[in-house]
């Protein structure tokens, strides 16, 4: 199966690293130090 | 309340199948991965298979693989186990255990907190 | 694959005392400082019930004398006071995203 995040996902995570969660189905994003929200774009 | 009910265990010769199934309530089943854990008699937990929520991510053990395929139908709010060329090691009560989880920051962690009460599956001549 | 090796294989504690079980796994179930252990209580006759997840958080409901703690390699469950009905197996688990989810083999506690 294709990791999303090489896909579709690719550019979700605006400040952070793209993580798929298998048993899940989801996506989530590991943001960098000082950023937050769903997609790592608030500070 | 959540509830896990087995059914589908029983005796079955070395070489033969059996299918289990899990019937849950509630809870949004289909938000949740699922697995089979057994217990041989007098032994510790063994996990046996996970399926991820929409059934796309399957897992086994060696022990297993190639024999035991696990399924779920979400309309259902069902999981299965089909189980072929049955072994006498085999013999066991089989538990489904939810998946409950933790996702925050990225981070993923999971751990199985809610059980049925397992069906027994004995496999014998 | 992770083994998980518990100790002992066996206890018997007085009722007022402290049990203690170890859980050692064979390579690291830490990720960015979190530890991916779970513990479990089973009584006879009875499916597991989860006690601990995550190395150190109790589950709900859980009396405040089960705690877990450790990182990396080496895990410990502790149960202090010990009360008659906590004569039971115990089980650690692995719950990394990778399998296979081992269990460690069991502790047997016994109230004398």
């Known amino acids: 199966k294709k990791n999303p995040c090489n896909a579709e996902f690719q550019n979700f995570c605006i400040h952070g690293e793209c993580k798929y969660i298998e048993h899940l189905e989801a996506v989530t994003c590991k943001c960098q130090q000082e950023y937050f929200g769903e997609r790592c774009g608030e500070k | 309340e959540v509830q896990l009910v087995e059914s589908g265990g029983g005796l079955v010769k070395p070489g033969g199948s059996l299918r289990l199934s899990c019937a849950a309530s509630g809870f949004t089943f289909s938000s949740y991965a699922m697995s089979w854990v057994r217990q041989a008699p007098g032994k510790g937990l063994e996990w046996v298979s996970t399926i991820s929520t929409g059934g796309s991510h399957t897992y086994y053990p060696e022990s297993v693989k190639g024999r035991f395929t696990i399924s779920r139908d979400n309309a259902k709010n069902s999981l299965y186990l089909q189980m072929n060329s049955l072994r006498a090691e085999d013999t066991a009560v089989y538990y489904c255990?939810?998946?409950?989880?933790?996702?925050?920051?990225?981070?993923?962690?999971?751990?199985?907190?809610?059980w049925g009460q397992g069906t027994l599956v004995t496999v014998s001549s | 694959d992770i083994v998980l090796t518990q100790s002992p294989a066996s206890l018997a504690v007085s009722p007022g005392q402290r049990a203690t079980i170890t859980c050692r796994a064979s390579?690291?179930?830490?990720?960015?400082?979190?530890?991916?252990i779970n513990w479990y209580q089973q009584k006879p006759g009875q499916p597991p019930k989860l006690l601990i997840y995550?190395?150190?958080n109790k589950d709900t409901g859980v009396p405040a004398r089960f705690s877990g703690s450790g990182s990396g390699t080496d895990f410990t469950l502790t149960i202090n006071p010990v009360e008659a009905e906590d004569t039971a197996n115990y089980y650690c688990q692995q719950s990394t995203e990778d399998p296979p989810y081992t269990f460690g083999q069991g502790t047997k506690l016994e109230i004398k």
């Open positions: 255990a939810r998946h409950g989880y933790l996702l925050y920051e990225g981070y993923y962690e999971w751990y199985f907190d809610y």
């Open positions: 390579e690291s179930v830490d990720y960015d400082g979190h530890s991916f």
């Open positions: 995550a190395a150190s």
